[in-house]
């Protein structure tokens, strides 16, 4: 049997011989060097060579446990002569012992950590952590100790687990924001004679809101014009907060002032500024100038910093409004006027008033933009603004005139303002009713005595407040011996009646029948309007069959005795 | 480089004895057996026995234990391998070769023996 | 004495094809995973050659295209694309113990 223990060797060998690790021996040796002591796997015949005769190992390279630290190799011990193994192949364990060879090594060179500032002291920072490839379970020389070489009073480190903490109270990062901590890592558990690695930690403090927001100044004093339109802005004001980010950002209000309504404050999100802006129009000649208390505050604030004061701060703003020469103004934003049509030439129908809105309250002249009445229709008294007829008018032509007036300063032609008017054309009864179209009828020979041969309708130009009344009746001159009548309907319609049985249409073929139309409106008006008559054979259902030839080709052929 | 150089062909008559040399070069002669291989014409190989040059220690085939002597000069790395009562049966080329763990490595270029009357 | 029998006595293979020769000993030649079996090739009126030892192991300088393999009792060795130059004949050798024998041989020609 093979007779050996686990080999140890210690690490980092720095004789001038090779390095003995120990022997390999079987039982079966009778030391006549019949055996071949072979070696192999981690290693041999380079880092460790065997004598074949006795089995003395040795380490030719100088080893490194923290490269390997167990080497595993096989034994064999063969017969020379014959090749015959004398026992089983054999593995074996080479063990390196360790020495202090290695220092500590940070996981990083350099560590970059935050914390907020004015944390309680003890707040952790960052853990660093440096290992030794030492081996740790033999001595102390993977044994870590951390301690602090630079960055006291500011942190501190626990000695055996590399927490970074900090170390004084109230730390300001407006005050100072970097930080640059020394850490060292010491092997042997601190003692003298250890090795030691060290490692930079980079600490930025992170802003906490610590500080309220200060306006530079107690006052601040704008002018806009009078003209500036609502959403005009008019200044910026600007906060100062000494934190950053969230932390800086500044709200804006008008908490003050007689300004209140009529201004606003808006915060530029990027700049952080509070831009006034008009809120209400403004009218120097009521008011020329406006006071504000505007106040700038911290939409997130950290309760714990409460006790530091408010988080906001009060400026007064004071807005001078200025004067602009503004157009003149009309009393109304549009007028509505009203004239007969029968106005005679020169009839002042109404008027506009404008004034200048300016202290100054220059004199206005007043026109008609011809644009809007290229007839010249109309006209105005310059001075005083009356609006008169220059052409006579026919509400049938034209209901409703729509002209613009124009009022214009006289000292500055530049300042004018335009206003419309609408004109009513009122009606007058100037119009007589008329048929409502050309009525060409017949009546059958066979025909019976007051049968209804036609319904006339008639129509007016007129437009009566009451609606129209017309009345129906023959001419005077057609009244006596007529052979129709005409029965008015009293609801704006008459029909033509026969006034006998029976036509003949050989003695007589066609009749002209004169209808006077009067309306009953004032002045009346009437017109004579005539209807023609034909005398036509018919079927016995009172269907024409035929009329005089002449009569249907000339139907306003005249003739008598209607 | 290993080399095995034996010495020239013999022609024996019966009942006599022949020894042939073989000359190692090229390696530590005592660190390795030599055997002695021979081969009779047309036949097969048959080993004969062999020698540890260190110790002089000796094996042979039963069948030649009572003709084979095999002898090592160390001072001139040479060994031989002596027959005697030599028979016709024993016309053969006889080989050196170096053993190293029961294989034969390296192999002499052979000696003709011829037993004839 | 182990006997060692080669099989078979003579092998004609075309060139470029797998030439298989196998050896059987008479009892284990095996001993602690170690075969202690051996392969060589003798050309004509050339001293042998040392291929293969310890069954499987190819000895320095072969050219690859030979193997071993097997243990105990039953050995075989192939060539595994036959060359011209390969035109020999194969022994197997046995050193697990005295006499050290040889099988009878194998002629390996071309076909």
């Known amino acids: 049997s093979w007779m050996w223990n686990q080999f140890f060797l210690l690490e980092e060998y720095t004789g001038s011989d090779y390095q003995y690790v120990g022997k390999l021996h079987s039982d079966q040796d009778r030391g006549d060097g019949s055996l071949k002591y072979i070696l192999s796997g981690d290693g041999a015949g380079d880092l460790f060579i065997i004598n074949e005769n006795t089995g003395d190992i040795q380490a030719t390279k100088r080893l490194d446990r923290e490269e390997k630290p167990v080497y595993i190799l096989r034994a064999q011990a063969i017969n020379r002569r014959t090749g015959r193994p004398v026992e089983p192949e054999s593995e074996f364990i080479i063990k390196i012992h360790d020495i202090n060879d290695n220092e500590p090594i940070f996981t990083k060179e350099v560590y970059t950590a935050t914390v907020p500032e004015m944390s309680d002291v003890g707040t952790f920072v960052v853990q660093v952590t440096a290992t030794d490839a030492d081996d740790p379970t033999y001595g102390n020389s993977a044994k870590v100790v951390y301690s602090i070489l630079q960055g006291q009073p500011y942190f501190s480190v626990e000695s055996e687990t590399g927490i970074i903490k900090t170390a004084l109270l109230n730390m300001d990062r407006e005050n100072r924001e970097q930080y640059q901590v020394v850490i060292q890592a010491k092997d042997m558990g601190g003692q003298m004679g250890g090795l030691s690695g060290t490692t930079t930690v980079n600490i930025t403090l992170t802003d906490v809101n610590d500080n309220p927001p200060r306006f530079p100044q107690s006052t601040y004093q704008f002018k806009t014009p009078e003209s500036s339109p609502p959403g005009t802005p008019i200044g910026r004001i600007k906060a100062s907060d000494a934190d950053v980010g969230e932390n800086a950002e500044i709200e804006y209000s008008i908490t003050d002032g007689e300004g209140l309504d009529m201004f606003d404050v808006i915060t530029d999100q990027e700049t952080q500024e509070g831009i006034i802006t008009v809120k209400k129009l403004l009218d120097f000649e009521k008011k020329k100038v406006y006071t504000l208390k505007v106040e700038a505050s911290n939409p997130y604030v950290e309760p714990r910093f409460l006790y530091l004061g408010p988080f906001k701060d009060s400026a007064t703003v004071r807005i001078v409004v200025e004067d602009v020469d503004e157009p003149p103004v009309f009393s109304k934003l549009a007028y509505i006027l009203q004239i007969r049509e029968d106005a005679q030439i020169n009839t002042t129908i109404g008027s506009v008033t404008a004034q200048d809105p300016d202290a100054a309250r220059n004199p206005v002249k007043y026109s008609v933009d011809r644009h809007t009445d290229m007839d010249r229709i109309f006209n105005i008294d310059s001075g005083n603004g009356s609006i008169f007829t220059s052409k006579l008018l026919d509400r049938e032509t034209l209901l409703w005139h729509n002209i613009t007036v124009i009022a214009t300063e006289i000292n500055n032609p530049k300042q004018s303002s335009r206003v419309p008017l609408y004109i009513k054309v009122l009606d007058v009864n100037d119009n007589a009713p008329e048929f409502a179209e050309f009525y060409e009828t017949f009546v059958c020979e066979k025909a019976k005595a007051d049968q209804l041969i036609q319904t006339l309708h008639a129509v007016d130009k007129d437009d009566p407040y009451s609606g129209h009344q017309f009345s129906f009746s023959l001419a005077p001159e057609a009244a006596s011996g007529s052979n129709f009548t005409i029965q008015d309907n009293k609801d704006n319609t008459a029909g033509i009646l026969t006034r006998k049985n029976g036509y003949n249409r050989h003695e007589m073929s066609t009749y002209l029948l004169p209808v006077v139309i009067s309306d009953n409106d004032y002045p009346v008006q009437s017109s004579t309007g005539t209807v023609t008559v034909r005398v036509c054979a018919c079927d016995h259902h009172g269907n024409m069959q035929s009329c005089h030839a002449e009569a249907l080709i000339h139907p306003t052929g005249l003739s008598t005795g209607a | 480089e290993v080399q095995l150089v034996q010495s020239g062909a013999e022609v024996k008559k019966p009942g006599s004895s022949v020894k042939v040399s073989c000359k190692a070069s090229?390696?530590?002669?005592?660190?390795?057996?030599m055997h002695w291989v021979r081969q009779a014409p047309g036949q097969g190989l048959e080993w004969m026995g062999d020698?540890?040059?260190?110790?002089?220690?000796?094996h042979y085939t039963q069948k030649f234990k009572d003709r084979v002597t095999i002898t090592v000069d160390k001072s001139t790395s040479t060994a031989y391998m002596e027959l005697s009562s030599l028979r016709s049966e024993d016309t053969a080329v006889y080989y050196c070769?170096?053993?190293?763990?029961?294989?034969?490595?390296?192999w002499g270029q052979g000696t003709t023996v011829t037993v004839s009357s | 004495d182990i006997v060692m029998t080669q099989s078979p006595d003579s092998l004609a293979v075309s060139l470029g094809e797998r030439a298989t020769i196998n050896c059987r000993a008479s009892?284990?030649?095996?001993?602690?995973?170690?075969?202690?079996m051996h392969w060589y090739q003798q050309k004509s009126g050339q001293p042998p050659k040392l291929l293969i030892y310890?069954?499987?192991n190819l000895e320095s300088g072969v050219p690859d295209r030979f193997s071993g393999s097997g243990s105990e009792t039953d050995f075989t060795l192939t060539i595994s694309s036959l060359q011209a130059e390969d035109v020999a004949v194969y022994y197997c050798?046995?050193?697990?113990?005295?006499?050290?024998?040889f099988g009878g041989g194998t002629k390996v020609e071309i076909k």
């Open positions: 070769a170096r053993g190293d763990l029961g294989r034969f490595d390296y």
């Open positions: 090229g390696y530590t002669f005592t660190n390795y057996w």
């Open positions: 020698i540890d040059p260190s110790h002089s220690e000796t």
């Open positions: 009892e284990s030649v095996s001993i602690h995973g170690t075969h202690l």
């Open positions: 310890a069954a499987s």
């Open positions: 050798q046995q050193s697990f113990e005295d006499p050290w024998t």
